[in-house]
Interface confidence: medium
Amino acid sequence: LRHVVYWNSSNPRLLRGDAVVELGLNDYLDIVCPHYEGPGPPEGPETFALYMVDWPGYESCQAEGPRAYKRWVCSLPFGHVQFSEKIQRFTPFSLGFEFLPGETYYYISVPTPESSGQCLRLQVSVCCKERKSESAHPVGSPGES
């Protein structure tokens, strides 16, 4: 399964911070960065860095300390940018992350200094089963971006 998350401040549940996505092993979490056609909003485009953090970092929406891992940067608001995280128990890649069944992982975005964005938060709950099929389950929508 591919679970698509449109990561932008038009997504009410990401804003509130109580969005939950349930993923199984071998699923993919696809993060779609904000995208603008033309000049973008008057307050400027949303650009940010996405981090995986621990619970205190999620609560405070702060990506600091040894348990904050920068995963991606959405810094090209006029391009089509998407990142993917494979939910797997073991990873062959040095930049990959290993996910344990039954655990919850926390993602936050920290706006860049020049950005109009707000703090956005997502909880990823990893379930137990390995899945083989592929279909899409988006969270959020392209919204205004």
């Epitope: 997504n11 009410p12 929508s141």
Partner: antibody, heavy 112, light 107 residues
């Protein structure tokens, strides 16, 4: 334009079950979570539960034994079913998409 | 369950005034608090999330603040259409719970 429209019976007899349908437009149910809330003069606003885009649910533990939330993505419909209604279940029942968009409400009266 | 207490069921104010609606949580909820406005006969409308962030389209005369257990919704330059009910909600823990509401009335 996001809209949620509710349909369901206005009057339910005690001990019977309640079914309300929330039909959404302007977005896909695989996109956002949908919460159910009820409001009564006695209990105020009370969160009943949520169904997430992927289909998983969370319920208010006080009502979990008689509450069920399900959906049909292809028909853009979310269903609330509550069993064994009593008079204190009389309330306005709302569906809400990610708290930003709300249905118009369904007034449910439990009475013989 | 976390209890959200809005101690004032009614508050009197005048158009142009500044009014502060309070909400107290029975335990620490961080900043996982939202505020809703409800006009008579209508569904609740979200105003504030994460204790202090306005939703898009909400006038800037509405300001939320607080963290932990004490939260406020401040309305500056109150307009006649603001004389309705306001509810706080915590979403730190299931079940999500609401305050009993505060209705603004004309002095």
């Amino acid at each position: 334009q996001v809209q949620l429209k509710q349909s369901g019976p206005g009057l339910v007899a005690p001990s019977q079950s309640l079914s309300i349908t929330c039909t959404v437009s302007g977005f896909s149910l695989t996109t956002y979570g949908v919460d159910w809330v009820r409001q009564s003069p006695g209990k105020g606003l009370e969160w009943l539960g949520v169904i997430w885009g992927g289909g998983s649910t969370n319920y208010n533990s006080a009502l979990k034994s008689r509450l069920s939330i399900s959906k049909d993505n292809s028909k853009s419909q979310v269903f609330l079913k509550m069993n064994s209604l009593q008079t204190d279940d009389t309330a306005m029942y709302y569906c809400a998409s990610d708290w930003a968009y709300w249905g118009q409400g369904t007034l449910v009266t439990v009475s013989a | 369950d976390i209890v959200m207490t809005q101690s004032q069921k009614f508050m009197s104010t005048s158009v142009g005034d500044r009014v502060t609606v309070t909400c107290k949580a029975s335990q620490n909820v961080g900043t996982n608090v939202a505020w809703f406005q409800q006009k008579s006969g209508q569904s609740p409308k979200p105003l504030i999330h994460s204790a202090s962030y306005r939703y898009s389209g909400v006038p800037d005369r509405f300001t939320g603040s607080g963290s932990g257990t004490d939260f406020t919704l401040t309305i500056t330059n109150v307009q006649s259409e603001d004389l309705v009910a306001y509810f706080c909600q915590q979403y730190k823990r299931y079940p999500y719970t609401f305050g009993g509401g505060t209705k603004l009335e004309i002095k």
